[in-house]
């Protein structure tokens, strides 16, 4: 599998409609929770929780602040922590508790605390529960949590130093935690947790499972340096711990290695960055997408692997275990365990079979089973990705977060659209197209190029958004910018499953937002632009330049995959010649203008799509080079003369439908010049679609005027 190509289109922050939320002097917007039914996005930040309108996040609905007292700050600072940054309350857990409350935990100046947030009054209830084991002490430490049926499952560190890792369930009747032992958790960096519900039609009375994803220091591989290993672990919701062995500890904690590598090149991605569980009506078993980087990442490599949850479950249900053996000099080595496995199977959830054997709860499990799982939490079998290879490998980028949306194209093909954020504040949107990756676009979400800390995807039909949190705020972006593709060719070449060309309106429309039937819409995921109708309208720009000056002819081709070239009187121009130059790889510069440079210039783009080359006329310019006469000024108009080479530009729209082009008597130009009314336009010219014409008050056409401009383009 080759590296993913560059994004086809790059949208700068100001180019697209992005909605932003930030409260001045509030930072670290790292916890996001969406309530689809209330159309509310809850945002946990440093010392604050906000509720904003999920359809327009700039609209704040509620705010509540949870600050650290000066006394607490001082005590924290005495322990060597920074009063300005670390000794504050970073909201780290933001989970739904009921229809009317959220469960919120914060680092609270290295004294983690949790509280209930009443959503009606938007006030904390003041419970001030100890957050130890639910929330990290240190805002820099890793954490993950998920609320399952009113109980919080979390992975974090249990002490001030962050040296004791823990996966726990906070429960009034049955709190559980991991053993504090290297075989269970070895310096983990927690990434994600989620619950996978048992299938309703499950015959074996199986239990819901909670999955944890983290990177930890390997116990099974010994090198000179510490080898990091990505892990998937799971516990059973019904686990109640053991009666004597593993009392108040998980009896169902098992973990396995996640494989994400490129076999042909020996590239191993062993640092897990983020995980997204894709649930879709069309999926029998959820698929989880995991985002990785290599341990030694000096070149900026990132990869995405997709896994069937059934593959992981198979490893836990039927896979081999690993065992530690002591070799010379008390050196511990982990190898495959081939001995007898006690019954019931260690780490298994209590199902119908176990109940039939009278094991109705983990409290009934025999010591042999419990002791085995205590000593053998690590599986020998690894969890391998779908197709045994990454979905995407990207060079020169550090991806930070991932969300995935399953959508159907017009032809019925289903695509998993990956939205992946970067450590420079951008969002990549990518799909797999016939065993290759197509990065549809890159959107600069954050102006200051700061890392995206959290990504969230709304799943409500109609209004779909991606929400991204960073240190400075939250940004809301639509799933697609279809309307930005101005021509049918652009719309088709985007190969965006969300977008299709609508010939009646001559616009690129978002599929999921069109209630009308999709008949007549054009979408070709192969990128075959020949399906586009012939252009009915075209436009060209007419410029007048003075002799000896320099002209810059614009060509706005957004595609990063296209090569732009220029034609003059149907001959291809050599941009390297002394006569011509390219500005920003697209705009044509013509130096030392003479009458021989007058004529028609066309900017064409050439884009390889699969095995085809698609050519497009992007812009057409008619250039006239003149010796500037003395300006004739209308008596009623004072004209200021300035130095420069541009005289005037005008825009003509040509039509092949028999309608006459708009002909304002006089047009203002980008350089402030005023030109004659246009001559009748030739028909059938190629298009440069959106051109804004600013007309000035009409003047009699016989008052011929030329203005020299200071605009030296």
């Amino acid at each position: 599998m080759a590296f993913a190509p560059i994004p086809r289109i790059t949208w700068e922050h100001r180019e697209v409609h992005l909605v932003q939320f930030h409260e001045p002097d509030i930072y670290n917007y790292s916890a996001l929770l969406l309530s689809e039914d209330k159309d509310t996005l809850y945002i946990g930040a440093r010392e604050a929780v906000f509720a904003v309108n999920a359809l327009n996040i700039s609209e704040k609905q509620h705010e509540v602040y949870w600050k650290v007292s000066e006394d607490k700050k001082a005590k924290c600072a005495e322990k060597g922590k920074s009063k300005q940054t670390e000794c504050l309350n970073y909201i780290r857990v933001l989970q739904p508790l009921s229809a009317t409350s959220l469960y919120v935990c914060g680092t609270n100046a290295f004294q983690p605390a949790c509280d209930h947030l009443n959503l009606t009054s938007f006030k904390f209830l003041g419970k001030n529960e100890d957050g130890k084991g639910r929330c990290p002490f240190d805002p820099a430490h890793s954490y993950t949590s998920v609320m399952v049926d009113g109980e919080l499952y979390s992975g974090t560190s249990y002490n001030f130093l962050g040296s004791e890792p823990i996966i726990s369930r906070n429960s009034s009747h049955s709190p559980l935690r991991t053993e504090y032992a290297i075989p269970w958790l070895n310096e983990p960096s927690f990434v994600f947790a989620d619950v996978i519900r048992k299938s309703p039609d499950s015959p074996d009375g199986e239990d819901d499972r909670v999955y944890f994803f983290f990177t930890e220091v390997s116990v099974e591989y010994e090198f000179v340096f510490r080898v990091l290993i990505p892990r998937i672990a799971r516990v059973c919701k019904g686990d109640q711990g053991g009666l004597r062995t593993l009392q108040k500890k998980w009896t169902s904690f098992l973990k396995a290695r996640l494989i994400c590598s490129r076999p042909d090149s020996g590239l191993v991605f062993n640092v897990l960055r983020d995980v997204f569980v894709l649930r879709s009506p069309g999926l029998k078993v959820p698929v989880f997408y995991a985002l990785f980087t290599p341990q030694l990442n000096n070149v900026g490599l990132s990869a995405v692997c997709a896994y069937n949850l059934s593959t992981a479950e198979e490893v836990f249900s039927h896979g081999k275990y690993m065992q530690s053996t002591t070799v010379e000099q008390s050196h511990t080595k982990w190898v495959r365990y081939n001995g007898p496995v006690p019954k019931p199977r260690p780490g298994a959830c209590i199902d119908s079979e176990a109940r039939a054997a009278n094991y109705t709860s983990s409290l009934n499990l025999p010591d042999k089973t419990l002791q085995f799982v205590k000593d053998h939490p690590l599986m020998d079998d690894s969890v391998t990705p779908i197709d045994n290879r990454p979905r995407l490998i990207k060079k020169d980028v550090n991806y930070t977060q991932i969300v995935v949306d399953r959508t159907q194209a017009l032809d019925g093909t289903v695509y998993d659209v990956m939205f992946v954020s970067t450590d420079r504040g951008a969002l990549h949107k990518a799909i797999s197209l016939e065993h290759a990756v197509h990065i549809i676009e890159e959107t600069q979400l954050f102006q200051d190029f700061e890392p995206v800390q959290t990504l969230l995807l709304s799943s409500k039909k109609g209004n779909r958004f991606v929400y991204a949190g960073s240190n400075s705020g939250v940004v809301q972006a639509p799933l697609a910018f279809c309307g930005k593709h101005g021509t049918c060719e652009d719309c088709v070449l985007a190969r965006d499953p969300y977008c299709a060309w609508s010939p009646p309106t001559a616009t690129c429309v978002a599929l999921h937002q069109t209630e009308s039937p999709s008949r007549g819409l054009i979408q070709e995921m192969s990128g075959d632009a020949s399906v586009c109708p012939d252009k009915s309208k075209g436009s060209y720009r007419q410029h007048f330049f003075k002799h000896g000056g320099t002209a810059e002819l614009k060509c706005s081709q957004k595609s990063n995959l296209a090569r732009v070239f220029w034609k003059f009187q149907n001959g291809v121009l050599k941009a390297e010649s002394p006569k011509y130059g390219l500005m920003g790889r697209k705009n044509l510069l013509i130096f030392n203008l003479s009458e021989g440079d007058s004529g028609v210039y066309q900017c064409l783009s050439e884009e390889r799509v699969k095995n085809k080359t698609v050519f497009q006329v992007v812009a057409k310019h008619v250039l006239e080079v003149k010796v500037v006469p003395k300006p004739v000024v209308a008596p009623t108009l004072s004209v200021v003369q300035t130095e420069g080479s541009r005289i005037a530009t005008k825009v003509l729209v040509a039509s092949t439908q028999g309608s006459s082009p708009p002909t304002p008597a006089v047009q203002a130009t980008s350089s402030g010049a005023i030109t004659l009314p246009p001559k009748p336009a030739p028909t059938g010219t190629s298009c440069e679609p959106k051109i804004v014409i600013n007309t000035v008050p009409q003047l009699h056409s016989e008052k011929t005027m030329y203005l020299k401009s200071s605009d030296n383009r």
Epitope: D25, K60, Q61, E63, V64, Y65, K67
Partner: antibody, heavy 118, light 107 residues
Framework: EVQLVESGGGLVKPGGSLKLSCAAS????????MYWVRQAPEKGLEGVAY????????YSVDKVKGRFTISRDNAKNTLFLQMTSLRSEDTAMYYC???????????WGQGTSVTVSS | DILLTQSPAILSVSPGQRVSFSCRAS??????IHWYQQRTNGSPRLLIK???ESISGIPSRFSGSGSGTDFTLSINSVESEDIADYYC?????????FGGGTKLEIK
């Protein structure tokens, strides 16, 4: 003890300019957002301009946009309000106040009087 | 802009009485309302923040309530030193507007 002391007010002709200052002490000035609030004679309070702790966010109300500029010097613990193209309706007592999310306007200065009259 | 309407414009009460000031917002503002007291020739002083949160140093007779669009500041036993103008202010949406104020007089 927290102190905010405004200065720079006075009598000015319409179209004229003034620069107000607010000297802060007794708290970590660079941690706080700051506000200028004014009160015309016998009238209510009106927020005029806001600046965040690090000057990254600046707001001003429409009626003073383009005429008033709020700024701060964290090294000198001072807040400023540069007022130009003054109008008679800008006549008011000008207060500086701290603004911190979660704290509201918890500290106020004693005010400085600005009179715009020909 | 969000409009805050305070009523009544003037409140006249006897010492020891309970008094309530009303502030109504033109749209829902959650609990992002703050109350200030301004005595004659003095600077405003924060009494209550975020609708109901008390401020250290402010007498406990001052309390606040409400959410959404209707808010109340109460003084449970008025004292002569409470003679002042009382303003509400919202912080849900910029510009952070003030109400027109209510003047408290003692009979």
């Amino acid at each position: 003890e927290v102190q905010l002391v405004e200065s720079g007010g006075g009598l000015v002709k319409p179209g004229g300019s003034l620069k107000l200052s607010c000297a802060a002490s007794g708290f970590t000035f660079s941690d706080y957002g700051m506000y200028w609030v004014r009160q015309a004679p016998e009238k209510g309070l009106e927020g005029v301009a806001y600046i965040s702790s690090g000057s990254s966010t600046i707001y001003s109300v429409d009626k003073v946009k383009g005429r008033f500029t709020i700024s701060r010097d964290n090294a000198k613990n001072t807040l400023f309000l540069q007022m130009t193209s003054l109008r008679s309706e800008d006549t008011a007592m000008y207060y500086c106040a701290t603004w911190l999310p979660g704290n509201a306007m918890d500290y106020w200065g004693q005010g400085t009087s600005v009179t715009v009259s020909s | 802009d969000i409009l805050l309407t305070q009523s009544p414009a003037i409140l006249s009460v006897s010492p020891g009485q309970r008094v309530s000031f009303s502030c109504r917002a033109s749209q829902s503002i959650g609990t992002s309302i703050h109350w200030y007291q301004q005595r004659t020739n003095g600077s405003p002083r924060l009494l209550i923040k975020y609708a109901s949160e008390s401020i250290s140093g402010i007498p406990s007779r001052f309390s606040g309530s409400g959410s959404g669009t209707d808010f109340t500041l109460s003084i449970n036993s008025v004292e002569s030193e409470d003679i002042a103008d009382y303003y509400c202010q919202q912080s849900i949406r910029w510009p952070y507007t003030f109400g027109g104020g209510t003047k408290l007089e003692i009979k």
